[in-house]
Interface confidence: low
């Protein structure tokens, strides 16, 4: 019986030990599991955060790429804009130069005309005077031949401008190179640049012009597409307002709805009509965001200057024997701080 | 003894069971550990990959941001270039129009001079002829008083400028250089530039002009959008590039370097020309917000000013007997790549 009890006690102990080992193992397993789960949670959290960051970065990248693409388009756009500007302005400039040529040619024509008419007038007057003298002298005395001879030199002296020329001039106006741009008729063109420079001195006792001869200044406040007019170039006060871009005299309509006729003595009215005229700056350097002016590379300079690459043949020189007018296109160093 | 053996067998079994449980637990623990380690490796790998991707994205983003910044600078540069272009061209155009005015004024002066000389010649000749006649007529006949009376009108011919010239001038319309480009007829060109220049001197008793005397200058095809060079104007090569904006002849500076030279007594006219003229800046510096103008290096000034930096001694008249217009400062062909 004692032995039995002893063995049973032994067995009991072993069973308890077994249970203890079992529960210890379970606890160990749970601990390991918990440890791993915590670690896994940290790792998964890291992954989630990383993925979120990746998505954010990818979005940022996509947005920036899209904006970058747009900005590249903008740069191309600017290149196009610059080309347009060059085109507009160079066209204006060539037109101005053409006009200068016209003015020059007309001036020559007029001087020729004046000289010619002067000579003609002298000749015709001398002729009539000679006849007159001949008659007078015949009535006075015998030795006509001598007197006639004395009268002859008249016809040989040129008279410049005399009475006759005065009249003839009034009947034949010098050529006016009135050049009016009418964009309505324009074909194959890009833009209307209406640059108007009016320089009229006050005219007194001016007789009425014949119909259709008014001086027309189209679209006074504008410069057509591409150029508002680098106008106001030292014109007299009377018509400085001609190129104003302000709302001057909007009611002053011209005969053709879009034409403004400046009759005598309206110049002052126009000048006075500019509301804030005294505050206006000189046309030609508008649209300047000066805050954007930074240092500029040579390439940029070239880009900015684009369009200078053109030779404009001006002034077909008709006669090398008169009046040399040197257009000394001297560079001015303008000390304005940008 | 039997009982003992029985108990010992029982104990043995329990021990074996204990060992089995122990090794089973150990195996289980190892398995769990391995499983977690594998899982952890995957997660860590994910994290590493994510981190690598994040770094890549961040790098890409940084690079793109840098490029974007550069591109934005380019855009600003383009804006600045464009503005420079606007200013440069505006200035050139102003100069052209100024020169046109000069040509006009000189033309007037020359016509006046021609007229004056003609009249003076007539007057002096008439005077000498009258004396001559008087002497001759006295030698011929008695009724001198009558003859002298007959000769009187001659002596009234003006010396210098007198009645006759007054009339001739008053009846002679000053040249109108209204340059009108009729773009309706214009073919193969990109834009209409309505540049009208009117420059009329004081005219008294002006008679009506004849109708239909305008001279029409047709717009020729000129540099299109994209601007192939506005030089396609068919002028003669003698005087290419009137208003060149190249940096040639930089030494040809005007008196004050930053002043536009205004020939003969035009200063007063210019000064007077505009109510608030005293507030206006020199031509070619329009629309400048001077408050925003920060200091800029000489290089930048040059870049900004492009070809505007020049004094144009407009029409330095060397000799009133010739009329070749030399437009100096030819344009250099600039191959600018934008």
């Amino acid at each position: 019986e004692l032995k039995k009890n002893e063995f049973q006690g032994e067995l009991e102990k072993q069973r308890e030990q077994l249970d203890k080992i079992q529960s210890s193992h379970n606890f160990q397993l749970e601990s390991v599991n918990k440890l791993y789960q915590d670690e896994k949670a940290v790792l998964v959290n890291n992954i989630t955060t990383g993925e979120r960051l990746i998505r954010v970065l990818q979005d940022q990248l996509k947005t920036l790429q899209r904006n970058y693409g747009r900005l590249q388009q903008d740069v191309l756009q600017f290149q196009k804009n610059q080309t347009n500007l060059e085109r507009k302005f160079s066209y204006d400039l060539s037109q101005c130069i053409n006009q200068m040529k016209e003015v020059k040619e007309q001036c020559e024509e007029r001087i020729e005309e004046v000289t010619k008419k002067g000579n003609e007038a002298v000749a015709s007057r001398d002729l009539s005077e000679n006849n007159d003298q001949r008659q007078q002298l015949q009535a006075l005395s015998e030795p006509q031949p001598r007197l006639q001879a004395a009268g002859l030199p008249h016809t040989e002296v040129p008279q410049g401008k005399g009475n006759v020329l005065g009249n003839s001039k009034s009947q034949t106006p010098a050529p006016s190179s009135e050049v009016v741009l009418d964009s309505k008729r324009q074909v194959e063109k890009e833009e209307t640049n209406e640059i108007q420079v009016v320089n009229e001195e006050p005219q007194r006792d001016r007789l009425p012009q014949e119909p259709g001869r008014e001086q027309v200044v189209e679209d006074r406040p504008v410069g057509g597409r591409g150029f508002g007019g680098a106008g106001e170039l030292g014109q007299t006060p009377q018509v400085q307002a001609a190129l104003s871009v302000s709302q001057e005299n909007p009611e002053m309509e011209g005969p053709e709805r879009d034409q403004l006729v400046i009759p005598d003595g309206q110049e002052e009215e126009q000048e006075a009509a500019g509301e804030g005229r005294n505050q206006q700056k000189l046309r030609g350097e508008d649209d300047y965001n000066m805050d954007e002016n930074e240092a500029e590379s040579e390439t940029d300079k070239q880009a900015a200057l684009a369009g200078n690459d053109r030779n404009i043949d001006v002034f077909n020189v008709e006669d090398q024997k008169r009046d040399t007018i040197n257009l000394l296109d001297q560079r001015e160093k303008r000390n304005h701080t940008l | 003894e039997l009982k003992k053996n029985e108990f010992q067998g029982e104990l043995e079994k329990q021990r074996e069971q204990l060992d089995k449980i122990q090794s089973s637990h150990n195996f289980q623990l190892e398995s769990v550990n391995k499983l977690y380690q594998d899982e952890k490796a995957v997660l860590v790998n994910n994290i590493t990959t994510g981190e690598r991707l994040i770094r890549v994205l961040q790098d890409q983003l940084k690079t793109l941001q840098r490029n974007y910044g550069r591109l934005q600078q380019d855009v600003l540069q383009f804006q600045k270039n464009q503005t420079n272009l606007e200013r440069k061209f505006s200035y050139d155009l102003s100069q052209c129009i100024n020169q046109m005015k000069e040509v006009k004024e000189q033309c007037e002066e020359r016509i006046e001079e021609v007229t004056k000389k003609g009249n003076e010649a007539v007057a002096s000749r008439d005077l000498s002829e009258n004396n001559d006649q008087r002497q001759q007529l006295q030698a011929l006949s008695e009724p001198q008083p009558r003859l002298q009376a007959a000769g009187l009108p001659h002596t009234e011919v003006p010396q210098g400028k007198g009645n006759v010239l007054g009339n001739s001038k008053s009846q002679t319309p000053a040249p109108s250089s209204e340059v009108v480009l009729d773009s309706k007829r214009q073919v193969e060109k990109e834009e209409t530039n309505e540049i009208q220049v009117v420059n009329e001197e004081p005219q008294r008793d002006r008679l009506p002009q004849e109708p239909g005397r305008e001279q029409v200058v047709e717009d020729r095809p000129v540099g299109g959008r994209g601007f192939g060079g506005a030089g396609e104007l068919g002028q003669t090569p003698q005087v290419q590039a009137a208003l060149s904006v190249s940096q040639e002849n930089p030494e040809m500076e005007g008196p004050e370097r930053d002043q536009l030279v205004i020939p003969d007594g035009q200063e007063e006219e210019q000064e007077a020309a505009g109510e608030g003229r005293n507030q206006q800046k020199l031509r070619g510096e329009d629309d400048y917000n001077m408050d925003e103008n920060e200091a800029e290096s000489e290089t930048d000034k040059q870049a900004a000013l492009a070809g505007n930096d020049r004094n144009i001694d407009v029409f330095n008249v060397e000799d009133q007997k010739r009329d070749t217009i030399n437009l100096l400062d030819q344009r250099e062909k600039r191959n600018h790549t934008l």
């Epitope: 903008d74 756009q77 600017f78 196009k80 804009n81 080309t83 347009n84 500007l85 964009s183 074909v187 194959e188 063109k189 890009e190 833009e191 209307t192 406040p221 504008v222 410069g223 597409r225 591409g226 150029f227 508002g228 871009v245 046309r283 030609g284 350097e285 508008d286 649209d287 300047y288 965001n289 | 804006q79 464009q82 503005t83 606007e86 505006s90 990109e190 834009e191 299109g224 959008r225 994209g226 192939g228 329009d286 629309d287």
Partner: antibody
Framework: DVKLVESGGGLVKPGGSLKLSCAAS????????MSWVRQTPEKRLEWVAT????????YYPDSVKGRFTISRDNAKNTLYLQMSSLKSEDTAIYYC???????????????WGQGTTLTVSS | EIVMTQAAFANPVTLGTSVSISCRSS???????????LYWYLQKPGQSPQLLIY???NLASGVPDRFSSSGSGTDFTLRISRVEAEDVGIYYC????????FGGGTKLEIK
Amino acid sequence: DVKLVESGGGLVKPGGSLKLSCAASGFTFSSYTMSWVRQTPEKRLEWVATISRGGTYIYYPDSVKGRFTISRDNAKNTLYLQMSSLKSEDTAIYYCTREYFSGDTYDYFDYWGQGTTLTVSS
Amino acid sequence: EIVMTQAAFANPVTLGTSVSISCRSSKSLLHSNGITYLYWYLQKPGQSPQLLIYQMSNLASGVPDRFSSSGSGTDFTLRISRVEAEDVGIYYCAQNLELYTFGGGTKLEIK
């Protein structure tokens, strides 16, 4: 957000005058060329006027030249259209538009206001 | 001036199908710089016009890629590949090679 709000429309008799305004917000007004475009009752679109960012370069079609004057006040972020000698054919919805990119006047209208209606009738 | 010509109405279209709208200019809009200065605007009912296409073939920002445009210097076509209800309105072509001009507009309606 770019916003253009026109005002000043109304009923005017032929020969009368009117001034339209356009208040701009959401962008740097002074950096952009601005235009007016109108839409006739027949739904035809017609460009009316354009002004460069600083106000120097101004363009009009022949139909309004000499009668309409475009101007701007960059300090007030406002665009104006002064109309005079109005005709019945000027009856339209007038839209204030921003031109894509500053400086050039060849580019498309990227933003439009809601429009203001002008009726010219006796 | 350059005249832009459009048909007043497009053939009524079924949702999901494609439609083409034509436009013709009186002068070539292709410039020597390679850019064709043609634009398409859409005016939805009760709204202001909005830009769809610039320089003939470029899609404006925010415009779905169902829209495409092609053409020569004078003949242009706007194509909508899968018409949606929101596409109804008046489609205007415009040029700015010269002073701006618009076509008369083509009205698109759904069957």
